[in-house]
Interface confidence: low
């Protein structure tokens, strides 16, 4: 509540997150021309990254381009990229959508299609849809522990969201356990009115808002956090503005003295922890 | 404008960036004692890193130290580091400028110079100048899409910088397209009065300020962002305070059961997106 | 001091950090069944990560699980995890504490103990204590250079913590050199009343607060930072809430065409740089 007589100051905050959970992933794996069903286990070191404070990322889906090497090859025949003669290909041209620099030659991509040859990591990444359902859809059951330390320097007051009396096996619930700071990812989405299974395919950004409305007067002292959740990316975004949340990263290695890489296009949920509020004192 | 009757609150912000562009890099490559010109393609997975929200990094230059292994070797003969006898070398000493721990012996670095032997990743990194012009100087033509979601919790108002009608092929221009949120990196530098080609050599930090001055009263509602740009690192900084922007990272691998690494000193531009502003309501 | 007549605005800040230092690590290394003492050197590329602005991480300790491969194996026999028959093991069950998915079989872990078999990265991570003393305890002598650029957009005023007159070989001291922005990590801990050697074992979070109280009136202008330090993680935290600061990351590689990984559980200090303050002008 707004107490106009109080001297208010904004919160200074530090956040630490810890994700827990294991996902079993089943996908088609092709080796030596034979495709078979592969099972693999993903733990925190596989699906999350050592990130800083106010954000953490959980990979929920991916597309791999294995064994890429720097050479010349036909670019991917996406809409409008096919050619019938060298005239269509411009030496030195970099199409923002493409993954390489054109050599000026029109070459066969497969038996039926020709595209401009590019200098690139080859074979170029196929522009295929993210797998549906998402490969790590079971991330819905992962949990995240959020530790939040806050400080009102002007009032020389410090506290944190985790109290000594809290139970490490609790799970946040808006009604039954609103002070527990262990959150099931699926519950966060439910609270925000979003469908985890759906968002997991393309990725997205989810906000976890921690609001501290602190009255620091000794006679009516209260200072506990309130958690709320809202989706931060635009689910209705036009294709040209890159809907969802994904990024590419590479694992580099050498094979027969040739540098190669596996390119991973990782889709997932970035969780942004947005801490705000004020401390007021007479 | 300052409406004193309004209740103002600071903005709560979340940012998502997406860099696009390909660079062709030409550099001297030495293999088996033979130096030849090498061409390589760098795409987003090669020159940028999966970073969090309010910052993104674009590598514009680099120096590689390949095939380092943990052993003993002479340290790099930088100014003041040469020796003529073991007396000059102190066992267990770590010079902050050096890359290893001295063994106490003075050994030949090359035909003409001797330096203190160190326990380190060997051969130690040569302290050579960053290549000029910068290897990825063409990053000037990369573009970045910035998505910014803002929230004024006290006023229960949320909006974003990307509008449904915006065109994904636009490019920001201060006069002709001030609401487009796709920025050419070179244009950002030009707006800030800086020379991209120059900064790309040593790296630097560039601020992209997004200012939301929102009037949330229904009868005179406006809430759109204003973009401005300014350089954040000190271009006149003394050598001892590490001018520019660079960091070292390593790619580890095994060769004949020996752990080795390639050390990369990456120079580049860190872009900090600084979102600020207030929402006011009667 | 609070000048009520002044128009105050919060600081907009950008931070850049640079850590320096080398650590010599001595640990038991087992190869081909033989355990011997191994010495290795860690430099910045080994113990820190390319992180964004307001945080940096220094690894002070670690536990490695080498040569893990995706297969079936007995889970680690932590308290309450042992079994005597298959009845105790539930096919498809993922214990949040475990590192895999149970197959439903109870199998020998070693000569004396049986545990549930899991599909996981095998052999599963041993839940052993972090080494004591910490392997990189000498990180106490590392230094960090902190560059901080601040801006009061409403007052169109910009400054930074590093002045042209500063000496790059200084070290911060509360009394003798309170404006030097090169900090010895051990000194930061001492100022905060904490024991670096102790915290280095399990890791922790340390706050470096930079307070700018700026009077921008021309006749009484002052605008310099004040540094203070406080520990941000809860040293008295219950085991269930994951005390200290650690995260797991993996180095992936192929051996005889089998994908393997080395899992590193990295303990260390995350330093959060918390910049706050106001600029006031008549």
């Amino acid at each position: 509540s707004d107490k106009l007589y109080q001297r208010k100051e904004p919160v200074i905050s530090s956040v630490h997150t810890k994700v827990k959970g294991i996902a079993e992933v089943t996908e088609n794996v092709t080796e030596g021309g034979v495709t078979k069903l592969g099972h693999s286990i993903f733990d925190t070191a596989d699906y999350t990254f050592p990130l800083q404070g106010n954000s953490f990322f959980v990979m929920t889906n991916y597309v791999k381009s294995e064994g890429q090497v720097q050479t010349l090859c036909p670019e991917y025949p996406r809409r409008g990229a096919q050619c019938s003669s060298d005239r269509r290909c411009k030496k030195g041209w970099m199409d923002p959508q493409s993954k390489g620099i054109q050599t000026g030659r029109c070459v066969p991509y497969d038996k039926t299609r020709k595209t401009c040859e590019v200098s690139a990591w080859c074979p170029t990444e196929e522009e295929k849809e993210a797998p549906r359902p998402a490969l790590l859809r079971s991330a819905e059951n992962f949990t995240v522990l959020i530790k939040n330390n806050i400080h009102f320097p002007g009032h020389n007051y410090t506290t944190r969201n985790i109290l000594p009396t809290m139970n490490g096996s609790c799970t946040f619930h808006k009604t039954w356990d609103p002070q527990c700071s262990i959150f099931r990812l699926g519950d966060i989405f439910q609270e925000a009115g979003e469908n985890f299974t759906e968002v997991a395919v393309q990725g997205g950004i989810m906000g976890i808002e921690i609001y501290w409305d602190c009255n620091l007067d000794s006679w009516s002292h209260h200072c506990r956090p309130r958690y709320s959740f809202r989706r931060l990316d635009d689910k209705n975004m036009d294709e040209s503005f890159v809907p969802g949340y994904n990024f590419r990263y590479a694992k580099y290695y050498k094979e027969n003295n040739v540098e190669k890489r596996t390119l991973i296009k990782a889709f997932g949920i970035r969780f942004d922890i947005l801490v705000f509020g004020t401390g007021g004192k007479f | 404008s300052d409406k004193l009757y309004q209740r103002k609150e600071p903005v709560i912000s979340s940012v998502h960036t997406k860099v696009k562009g390909i660079a062709e890099v030409t550099e001297n490559v030495t293999e088996g004692g033979v130096t030849k010109l090498g061409h390589s393609i760098f795409d987003t997975a090669d020159y940028t890193f999966p970073l969090q929200g309010n910052s993104f990094f674009v590598m514009t230059n680099y120096v590689k130290s390949e095939g380092q292994v943990q052993t003993l070797c002479p340290e790099y003969p930088r100014r003041g580091a040469q020796c003529s006898s073991d007396r000059r070398c102190k066992k267990g000493w770590m010079d902050p400028q050096s890359k290893g721990i001295q063994t106490g012996r003075c050994v030949p670095y090359d035909k003409t110079r001797k330096t203190c032997e160190v326990s380190a990743w060997c051969p130690t990194e040569e302290e050579k100048e960053a290549p000029r012009p910068a290897l990825l100087r063409s990053a000037e033509n990369f573009t970045v899409l910035i998505k910014n979601n803002i929230h004024f919790p006290g006023h229960n108002y949320t909006t974003r910088n990307i509008l449904p009608t915006m065109n994904g092929s636009c490019t920001f221009h201060k006069t002709w397209d001030p609401q487009c949120s796709i920025f050419r990196l070179g244009d950002i530098f030009q707006e800030a009065g800086e020379n991209f080609t120059e900064v790309a050599v040593q790296g630097g930090i560039m601020g992209i300020e997004i200012y939301w001055d929102c009037n949330l009263d229904s009868w005179s509602h406006h809430c759109r962002p204003r973009y401005s740009f300014r350089r954040l690192d000190d271009k006149n900084m003394d050598e001892s305070f590490v001018p520019g922007y660079n960091f070292r990272y390593a790619k580890y691998y095994k060769e004949n059961n020996v752990e080795k690494r390639t050390l990369i000193k990456a120079f580049g531009i860190r872009f900090d997106i600084l979102v600020f502003g207030t929402g006011g309501k009667f | 001091s609070d000048k009520l007549y002044q128009r105050k605005e919060p600081v907009i800040s950008s931070v850049h950090t640079k850590v320096k230092g080398i650590a010599e690590v001595t640990e038991n290394v087992t190869e081909g069944g033989v355990t011997k003492l191994g010495h290795s050197i860690f430099d910045t590329a080994d113990y820190t990560f390319p992180l964004q602005g307001n945080s940096f991480f220094v690894m002070t300790n670690y536990v490695k699980s080498e040569g893990q491969v995706q297969t079936l194996c007995p889970e680690y026999p932590r308290r309450g995890a042992q079994c005597s028959s298959d009845r105790r093991c539930k096919k498809g069950w993922m214990d949040p504490q475990s590192k895999g998915i149970q197959t439903g079989r109870c199998v020998p872990y070693d000569k004396t103990r049986k545990t549930c078999e899991v599909s996981a990265w095998c052999p599963t991570e041993e839940e052993k204590e972090a080494p004591r003393p910490a392997l990189l305890r000498s990180a106490e002598n590392f230094t960090v250079l902190i560059k901080n650029n601040i801006h009061f957009p409403g007052h169109n005023y910009t400054t930074r913590n590093i002045l042209p007159t500063m000496n790059g070989s200084c070290t911060f001291h509360k009394t003798w050199d309170p404006q030097c922005s090169i900090f010895r990590l051990g000194d930061i801990f001492q100022e905060a009343g904490e024991n670096f050697t102790e915290v280095a074992v399990q890791g922790g979070i340390m706050g470096i607060e930079i307070y700018w109280d700026c009077n921008l009136d021309s006749w009484s202008h002052h605008c310099r930072p004040r540094y203070s330090f406080r520990r941000l993680d809860d040293k008295n935290m219950d085991e269930s809430f994951v005390p200290g600061y650690n995260f797991r990351y993996a180095k992936y590689y192929k051996e005889n065409n089998v994908e393997k990984r080395t899992l590193i559980k990295a303990f260390g200090i995350r330093f959060d740089i918390l910049v706050f303050g106001t600029g006031g002008k008549f």
Epitope: - | T159, L163, P164, T165, M166, N167, C170, T175, W176, D177, P178, Q179, C180, N215, S220, H221, H222, C223, R224, R226 | -
Partner: nanobody, 127 residues
Framework: EVQLVESGGGLVQPGESLRLSCTAS????????IGWFRQAPGKEREGVSC????????AYADSVKGRFTISRDIVKHTVYLQMNSLQPEDTAVYYC????????????????????WGEGTLVTVSS
């Protein structure tokens, strides 16, 4: 599809007032620049007044300055044109139009690159 629906037109005597409303469906008014345009019989369409979302500023044709006021109610998703001291030369079909900020334009005296247009409402000023 963005729809703009004008209302409030009608027959008035010289010197009287009228308030036109433009209601937008399925889109937020703070996403667009909004303009009122008019077309008198046998004449070209002209800009009357615009409101720029970027900074909330407004612009008016010289012929209506001081008499017409453009305003907006974000809650009701409605833009208004308050017309005072109406004259016979104000007789026209009045159109509401919207377009994204990213197109630089002068809505006054007239620029018809707006993306979305209403059907129009007739205002007749006659004694």
């Amino acid at each position: 599809e963005v729809q703009l629906v004008e209302s409030g037109g009608g027959l008035v005597q010289p010197g009287e007032s009228l308030r036109l409303s433009c209601t937008a469906s399925r889109f937020m008014l703070d996403y667009y620049d909004i303009g009122w345009f008019r077309q008198a019989p046998g004449k070209e369409r002209e800009g009357v007044s615009c409101r720029f979302t970027n900074d909330g500023s407004t612009a008016y044709a010289d012929s209506v300055k001081g008499r017409f006021t453009i305003s907006r109610d974000i809650v009701k998703h409605t833009v208004y044109l308050q017309m005072n001291s109406l004259q016979p030369e104000d007789t026209a079909v009045y159109y509401c139009a919207a377009g994204p900020l990213t197109k630089r334009r002068q809505c006054v005296p007239g620029d018809f690159s707006m993306d979305f247009w209403g059907e129009g409402t007739l205002v007749t000023v006659s004694s």
